[in-house]
Structures are given as C-alpha cells and as structure tokens.
C-alpha cells in the first residue's frame, strides 16, 4: 500500500465513555490535524475508514458495522456506539484516503464502569462557582448531537448519590442546575442523567462534574501584606542570621497572576552580591484565597547589610503593594566594668 501520513497515537485525547451508554466520537483528523473538514474531503472523493486495536492486542482489525441494532455505526466523521460495551476499550484509527492521498490518526477509547452513586475512574471537569454571588448555573456537558432538537429528553440531577429535589439553594432547570446562593456546602460532584428515546429504545447519558465554590470577585481586594509590618523590628548584631518573613494574603481571582518578591536596595536579590536565600511556602483557604510566605535569609549579616532597605512586593490582578521591613543594628549592651564604672567616676 502507498505511503500514509501517520499521526500516530493521539494520547492528548484520552476519550473516556461510560459502559452501556451511547457515545459519539469525531475523527480527530479534521479537528486537529488537517486544514479541511469532512465535507470538503468527501466532496473531493476521499473516503473515511475506521478500524481498531483491542486492549492488550497488537492486531489492527476492521470495526464490525454489522452488529445487531447497528450497535456501532459511522455517520460522516463520527463513530457511534449505541451503546458501548466494556470490551470496546482500545485504540481506534480513522484513515482518510483515496488512490493518491492517505492520512490517519489513532486515539485511545476507554469504556469505564460506574457504580450506583456515579463513582468511576472518569476524569471530572471542575466548575468554579463564586461564593454568595447570586444565581449561577452549571450546564449538563457534552450532550450535543446525541438527539435532534425535536426530542425532549428527561434530565435528572444528583449531588453525589442523592437526587436533587427540594434542596434549599439548588434548583434543577432541565439541562441547567441553578445555584441561588453558592456556599461551601455546595462543593461536591454533580451528575446529570439525560434520558432520551431513539428508534423504540431508551438511552441514558451520564455526565458528572465537580463544583468548587471559590472567593467572589465582589470581595476581592489587592494583596494584603501581613508581614513585614510597622510593629516588628528586625534588630540584629553583625554575624547573626537575619530572617525576614514576607506573608501576603491574596483574594481568589480567576486567572490572576499572584506574585511575591523581595528587593534589596531597590534591586532583585540575584542582582546584588549579598549571600541571600529565599524560601517560599503557599497555603490555600477553602475558597482558594491564597497566603504566600517568602522568608528572606542572610546567614551571617554584616553591619552594611543592616543598613540596607528590604522591601517585600506583592502583585495580583487587583493591584500591587509593597512594604519595607524595619531592620536595624542592635546596640551592644554596655560592659559594666568599663562603661558603668566610668559613669560613676571610678578611676
């Protein structure tokens, strides 16, 4: 056979589908690899061929499109399972070809089992809701194209294992689930089960997503520097270790770039010759507000170092702040025998 542009196994699309449910999988060639769509290819006389390799096998084999009730079928650039079976797991290849052209790509399909509470190895998308922000909605994902608009499916929503009905602040509204006032107690996994008829059969689509309630932009503030502050003076003798923590609170802000850095005499630490180290730690609240601490450390501080300006800077999408640490050289305690004795007029 003539040479074929082989895009290999496209592992970036780890497709997971539930057992005993319909699945429609588009050939990735047209979405990610080729500059034309299926219609153009079809008009140009190109044919789309599907085949697969079963899990733990090396042998490529054709897909059986003659199963009872057309369990597996192809429609344009979509491979349909009505429904999937556990042993459909494997690597699927779609190949576009004619006598002069050939291009193909493989992708992994995993059919996964779920328990009665919708727990499964499925990777779950995360949807963030703002705390106490007013009405917010989540939508049952990835159900487009399974049934025509003339079909009116029934949709049942669950939180964890429990059907959502008569919940205080969560209201099912068809494909949408509305949160009147999102609270921390609304964190969890939400599942929509879409039931629709097709050719005298009933199919179910199960979609689960994780809801995470985060800080509201209404409450977001510029970074707050808790330390250094005006109440703490870092008083050291030359030769001692100087440790100055910079502790900054950041409100949660979607996609905000939160940064903390020190300057010494207006320069970044690596632009000066002092032997300084900086260690960082980060902690998060339940609503994903962030506290960052950067500890500036000089092992053996010199009298010159104690005259320098140490400033902690913080920046988020809400603004930038800076605070200088109060650093001074400790005045040595008087040596009694000499200084005090002289003070009393001793000779």
């Amino acid at each position: 056979s003539e040479r074929c542009d082989d895009w290999g196994l496209d592992t970036m699309r780890q497709i997971q589908v539930f057992e005993d449910e319909p699945a429609r999988i588009k050939c990735p060639l047209f979405e990610h690899f080729l500059k034309f769509n299926y219609s153009t290819a079809h008009s140009a006389g190109l044919t789309l061929i599907w085949y697969w390799t079963r899990q733990d096998r090396d042998l490529e084999e054709p897909i059986n499109f003659r199963l009872p009730e057309n369990r597996i079928s192809k429609e344009k650039d979509v491979l349909w399972f009505r429904p999937t079976l556990l042993n459909d797991t494997g690597n699927y290849t779609c190949m576009l070809r004619n006598t002069t052209y050939c291009s193909k790509v493989a992708f992994p399909l995993e059919v996964v089992q779920k328990d009665s509470c919708f727990n499964s190895p499925m990777k779950l998308p995360v949807h963030k809701l703002y705390i106490e922000y007013g009405i917010q909605r989540i939508t049952c994902p990835n159900v487009d194209g399974y049934f025509p608009s003339s079909v009116k499916p029934t949709i049942t929503w669950y939180m964890g294992c429990y059907k959502i009905q008569n919940f205080n602040n969560v209201i099912p509204e068809g494909m949408n689930l509305s949160f009147l006032i999102a609270l921390i107690s609304n964190n969890g996994n939400y599942t929509c089960v879409v039931t629709y008829p097709e050719n005298g059969r009933t199919f179910h689509l199960t979609r689960t997503l994780t809801v995470k309630v985060v800080g509201s932009p209404k409450n977001a503030v510029p970074p707050v520097i808790h330390s250094p502050n005006d109440h703490v003076v870092y008083e050291k003798e030359p030769g001692e270790e100087l440790l100055i923590p910079c502790t900054v609170y950041f409100s949660f802000l979607m996609d905000s770039r939160n940064e903390v850095w020190w300057t010494i005499d207006g320069k970044k630490p690596d632009d000066i010759t002092i032997d300084v180290t900086i260690n960082e730690s980060i902690s998060h609240s339940r609503t994903e507000d962030e506290t960052r601490t950067q500890i500036l450390s000089i092992k053996k501080v010199t009298s010159e170092d104690l005259k320098r300006s140490y400033v902690c800077h913080a920046r988020s999408a809400k603004g930038e702040v800076a605070k200088a640490a109060k650093v001074k050289q400790k005045v040595p305690a008087p040596r009694y025998t000499v200084e005090l004795a002289c003070g009393f007029g001793a000779t």
Partner: antibody, heavy 117, light 107 residues
Framework: QVQLQESGPGLVKPSETLSLTCAVS?????????WAWIRQPPGKGLEWIGN???????YYNPSLESRVSISLDTSKHQVSLKLKSVTYADTAVYFC??????????WGQGTMVTVSS | EIVMTQSPATLSVSPGERATLSCRAS??????LAWYQQKPGQAPRLLIY???TRATGIPARFSGSGSGTEFTLTISSLQSEDFAVYYC?????????FGGGTKLEIK
Amino acid sequence: QVQLQESGPGLVKPSETLSLTCAVSGYSASGLYYWAWIRQPPGKGLEWIGNIYHSGRTYYNPSLESRVSISLDTSKHQVSLKLKSVTYADTAVYFCARDRFDGFDIWGQGTMVTVSS
Amino acid sequence: EIVMTQSPATLSVSPGERATLSCRASQTINNILAWYQQKPGQAPRLLIYGASTRATGIPARFSGSGSGTEFTLTISSLQSEDFAVYYCQQYNNWPLTFGGGTKLEIK
C-alpha cells in the same frame, strides 16, 4: 550575567514528541522567578507556551496544556520543554526566557524546529 | 484569556520622526504590560515594563504610557536601528498573552 541557550533536534516527525533544553549560565540560586518557553511560527507573532517557577510550579497556555510539559533541573541549570503529538502547526522558532515578574528580560537566541515527515 | 490587539499592523515613518504604536487589552490589566522589539533573525528584546518603565540599557527616546486597557509606545525620534517589529504583552493574568505585533518600516 545570565545567558540562555536552547538546544534540541531541528526536525521532528508528526505525532512525535518535541524535546528541547535551555541551558542557563550565570544562574543565581537566590532567584525566585520563572523560566519560560515562547515560540514563533515562521512569519508570525509570539506565542507563550508556559512558565515554570523556581519551586517547580507550572503554568501553561490552555491551547497547548494537554500536550506540553516544562521541567526545571536546578542542579544542571537546565529548563526543558516537551511537546507531545506534534503537527505541522508546531513548526516554529522556540525561545526560552527569564521572567522576573516584569516581562521577559533575558532571552535565548532561539532554536528552529520543523515538523515534517 | 486576555486578548491583546496592536495597531496599526504596519507603520511607515521617516527617520528622525516620531512613531506612536498602540496596544489594547480586552479587559483591564492595570499597568502590567511590557513592550518588546524584535529584529529579523533575533530574539525579542525587552524595552518597557510596568507600561512605562524603561528596561536596563534602553535609550530615553523610547517611552511607554497608558493604564487599564489602552497603552502606547512612543519613539520620539526614529533612528535607523529602530525599524523592527514591536510586540506588547500582558503579564497581569494567566495565560500570558502577546499582541500580534506592529511592523515599523522606513517611509
């Protein structure tokens, strides 16, 4: 003075993994900042790929996130880029750069990577 | 993501004249913006950060202004070495994004 030098194969086959290394010289251990990868397809503009912080925390361009991985080896003073399942659209000059919170202040000279079968 | 839009795509100016390049952000980025200059076959060079602060070694003829969503790079008196492509970049939010560039050419 910090200097950056990208290296790696100039030719990668479609569907394979692109692997590049950025050697950092004049590196300071006290620098809590980012190393970045940026690319530029022929005749086009700049596209940010991702940043890695001193601690190993990473941020990626969402359009590449499922395929990209950036790592930092502080002992070797190296920043690495891996881009899986490459296509012809990944043909570009790849730059590494330093990001000290105020833009990319130091850049490598860039390395051209062509995706071709 | 924040979309950065630069205008014009190409600007023709005579040496010695003033050049004004614009950059617009799709949402507010405070003053967290950088400008870069890139010459053919070279890596970009940081010119301005924080919307208006010149990077080390950048001549005083380069100045940046603006805050929020509208930003300007001004080159007061164009020298022959200034003809290049200029990019703006926001670093206020992830993902970091660049403008499409303005090519500054000799009139």
